[in-house]
C-alpha cells in the first residue's frame, strides 16, 4: 500500500478550522492477523528524510491521535482527549483519513505527517507516510478562509494526468461523485428558496499539474485534487471520455489553488432549470464514472 496527500500546502487564517487529508491506496491485506494504525504527528522541515523526526500535535502524541483497524474492525480513536485539544482524527472506507484542527493559531504552523502502520501478528511494523505543510497567517495578508494547494512536486515538468494510475483517478472521482451527488440531493428545502444566483456546483477532481510521479524512487504517485467548477456540457464530455477509457485532456482540469469547502456542506443551489440541468449533467457524468470505474 501507499499513501497520497491530496494537498501539499494549506494556508489558513487564525481562528479558522482546517482538515488535513491523506489517502491510502494500493493492495491492503485484510487478514485477521493484520492490524492497521493511521495517525498524525508533526515533524521538522529540512530533514534528510521527511517525517523522520516526530513531535506531538497540540501536546498529543501519535498514539493519542491514532485510528486503529484490527482485521475488519471499524476505526476508533481516543476522541474525548483529542477533542479537548480541538483535534479530531477520522477515517472512511475509501482509504481517506484526516485530522481536523479547530481554532487555528500561529503555533499550529508547521509540517504535518500522516502515517499508516501495518502490523502482523507478533511482528514489527511496516509504515508509510505522507507530508503536508500548514501555514497559519494573521493580518491583512491572511486569506479569508483556508486555501489548499495541490501536491505538485514537479509542476514545471508535469507529465500530465496519465502518470497518475487510472484507478486512483477513479477512486478520487467516485468518492467525489458520491459526496457531491448525495450532498446536493440532501440539501434542505430552505436552501432551494435562496433568491441569489446559484454558485457552480463543485466536484472534487484531480488536477493535471499534480498528477505526476514523485521523483523519489520508492514513493507513491502523488495524486491530488482541487475543487473545480465544470461549465455546461463539459460534464457530459468528461463523462464520455472517461467511459471510453481516455484520461481526460488538460482542458478539463483546473490546477489552481482550491478553496477548502467545509465538509458535509455542499454548495447551495436555487430552484430553477439551471440547477436541475447542472445536476443532470453531474448525474450523467457520475454514472459514467461509477460504470467505467467498476470495470477496472
Amino acid at each position: 500500500f501507499k499513501v497520497a496527500t491530496l494537498y501539499s500546502l494549506y494556508v489558513c487564517p487564525e481562528g479558522q478550522n482546517v482538515t488535513l487529508t491523506c489517502r491510502v491506496f494500493g493492495p491492503v491485506d485484510k487478514g485477521h492477523d493484520v492490524t492497521f494504525y493511521k495517525t498524525w504527528y508533526r515533524s521538522s522541515r529540512g530533514e534528510v528524510q521527511t517525517c523522520s523526526e516526530r513531535r506531538p500535535i497540540r501536546n498529543l502524541t501519535f498514539q493519542d491521535l491514532h485510528l486503529h483497524h484490527g482485521g475488519h474492525q471499524a476505526a476508533n480513536t481516543s476522541h474525548d482527549l483529542a477533542q479537548r485539544h480541538g483535534l479530531e482524527s477520522a477515517s472512511d472506507h475509501h482509504g481517506n483519513f484526516s485530522i481536523t484542527m479547530r481554532n487555528l493559531t500561529l503555533l499550529d504552523s508547521g509540517l504535518y505527517c500522516c502515517l499508516v502502520v501495518e502490523i502482523r501478528h507478533h511482528h514489527s511494523e511496516h509504515r508509510v507516510h505522507g507530508a503536508m505543510e500548514l501555514q497559519v497567517q494573521t493580518g491583512k495578508d491572511a486569506p479569508s478562509s483556508c486555501v489548499a494547494y495541490p501536491s505538485s512536486s514537479q509542476e514545471s515538468e508535469s507529465k500530465g494526468p496519465s502518470s497518475c494510475p487510472f484507478w486512483v483517478i477513479c477512486s478520487l472521482l467516485s468518492s467525489s461523485c458520491t459526496q457531491t451527488l448525495f450532498g446536493t440531493l440532501a440539501l434542505s428545502p430552505q436552501a432551494h428558496r435562496n433568491p441569489s444566483p446559484p454558485p457552480p456546483l463543485l466536484l472534487h477532481i484531480p488536477s493535471a499539474s499534480s498528477l505526476v510521479q514523485s521523483p523519489e524512487a520508492h514513493s507513491p504517485s502523488i495524486c491530488s485534487g482541487v475543487s473545480a467548477p465544470l461549465a455546461s456540457l463539459e460534464w457530459l464530455c468528461l463523462g464520455s471520455h472517461l467511459w471510453l477509457g481516455k484520461v481526460p485532456h488538460d482542458r478539463y482540469w483546473v490546477p489552481q489553488a482550491a478553496k477548502c469547502c467545509p465538509s458535509h456542506q455542499p454548495p447551495m443551489t436555487s430552484e430553477g432549470w439551471g440547477s436541475r440541468i447542472q445536476l443532470l449533467q453531474i448525474s450523467v457524468f457520475c454514472v459514467s464514472v461509477f460504470l467505467r470505474c467498476s470495470l477496472l
Epitope: Y37, R55, F62, Q63, D64, I119, H123, S124, E125, H126
Partner: antibody, heavy 121, light 112 residues
Framework: QVQLVQSGAEVKKPGASVKVSCKAS????????INWVRQAPGQGLEWMGR????????YYNEKFKDRVTMTRDTSTSTVYMELSSLRSEDTAVYYC??????????????WGQGTTVTVSS | EIVMTQSPATLSVSPGERATLSCKSS????????????LAWYQQKPGQAPRLLIY???TRESGIPARFSGSGSGTEFTLTISSLQSEDFAVYYC????????FGGGTKVEIK
C-alpha cells in the same frame, strides 16, 4: 543533539531494589519509546522492556515482568527502571536506549552511557 | 522467541585485512509486506555503550564509515569490515527487531 544520560553506579544487597534513571534531551521525549537493556559481565545484551513516555504504558520481557517497573516523569523528561528482589546474577550494566518504532519494534538508534549495578552481600 | 546465533565468538584479524562476521536467526526476519529484513548490527567497545552501525540488514547509519557493510536476507546475515582500522577492534552484536527484541551473543574482533 539527541542524548540519554543515566544515573551513577549503584551497589545493592540481595533482596533490595534499585532504581536507575535515564534523562532524555534533544528530541520530543513523549514520542519515542525508551528501552532498558542489560549486560552481565562478559555477557551479551538482554532486553528487559520498554516504556512509551507519552502514555506511560510499559511492556516487559516475560523474564523480568514480576520484578521490573518502568515509569516516566514528563516534567523532567526522565525514565526510571526499578528492579526489585535483587540477586547476585542481576549484577550488570543497565542501558537505556531509544527506539524509533510507532507500534511495533525498531532498532535502537540512541543509547545511554550505562549504569553499573552491583549486587553483593 | 527468535534466537540469534553469531559466529565466530572471536575473530583474530590483522589491521588492514577484511573481517567477516556471521549472524543466523532461528526464523526469518524478513517482513513480507515491505521485503525488509528487521536486523541491525551494533559495535561495542570496552566500557562504552553499543553504537548502531547497520539497520535493515544493509543500511549504514549516518556517520558510519563505508568500510562497514551488511548483507544477507531471511535467516543468514553478514557484517563485513573491508579494511580493519585500529578503532574497529571491538565486540559486534546482531539484533533482530521483527518479533520483540533479541540479540546475538556477539563476536569479538581482536588484533591478530
Amino acid at each position: 543533539q539527541v542524548q540519554l544520560v543515566q544515573s551513577g553506579a549503584e551497589v545493592k544487597k540481595p533482596g533490595a531494589s534499585v532504581k536507575v534513571s535515564c534523562k532524555a534531551s534533544g528530541y520530543s521525549f513523549t514520542d519515542y519509546y525508551i528501552n532498558w537493556v542489560r549486560q552481565a559481565p562478559g555477557q551479551g545484551l538482554e532486553w528487559m522492556g520498554r516504556i512509551f513516555p507519552g502514555s506511560g504504558n510499559a511492556y516487559y520481557n516475560e523474564k523480568f515482568k514480576d520484578r521490573v517497573t518502568m515509569t516516566r516523569d514528563t516534567s523532567t523528561s526522565t525514565v526510571y527502571m526499578e528492579l526489585s528482589s535483587l540477586r547476585s546474577e542481576d549484577t550488570a550494566v543497565y542501558y537505556c536506549a531509544r527506539d524509533d518504532s510507532f507500534y511495533g519494534y525498531w532498532y535502537f538508534d540512541v543509547w545511554g552511557q550505562g549504569t553499573t549495578v552491583t549486587v553483593s552481600s | 522467541e527468535i534466537v540469534m546465533t553469531q559466529s565466530p565468538a572471536t575473530l583474530s584479524v590483522s589491521p588492514g585485512e577484511r573481517a567477516t562476521l556471521s549472524c543466523k536467526s532461528s526464523q526469518s526476519v524478513l517482513y513480507s509486506s515491505n521485503q525488509k529484513n528487521y536486523l541491525a548490527w551494533y559495535q561495542q567497545k570496552p566500557g562504552q555503550a553499543p553504537r548502531l552501525l547497520i539497520y535493515w540488514a544493509s543500511t549504514r547509519e549516518s556517520g558510519i564509515p563505508a568500510r562497514f557493510s551488511g548483507s544477507g536476507s531471511g535467516t543468514e546475515f553478514t557484517l563485513t569490515i573491508s579494511s580493519l582500522q585500529s578503532e574497529d577492534f571491538a565486540v559486534y552484536y546482531c539484533h533482530q527487531y521483527l518479533s520483540s527484541y533479541t540479540f546475538g551473543g556477539g563476536t569479538k574482533v581482536e588484533i591478530k
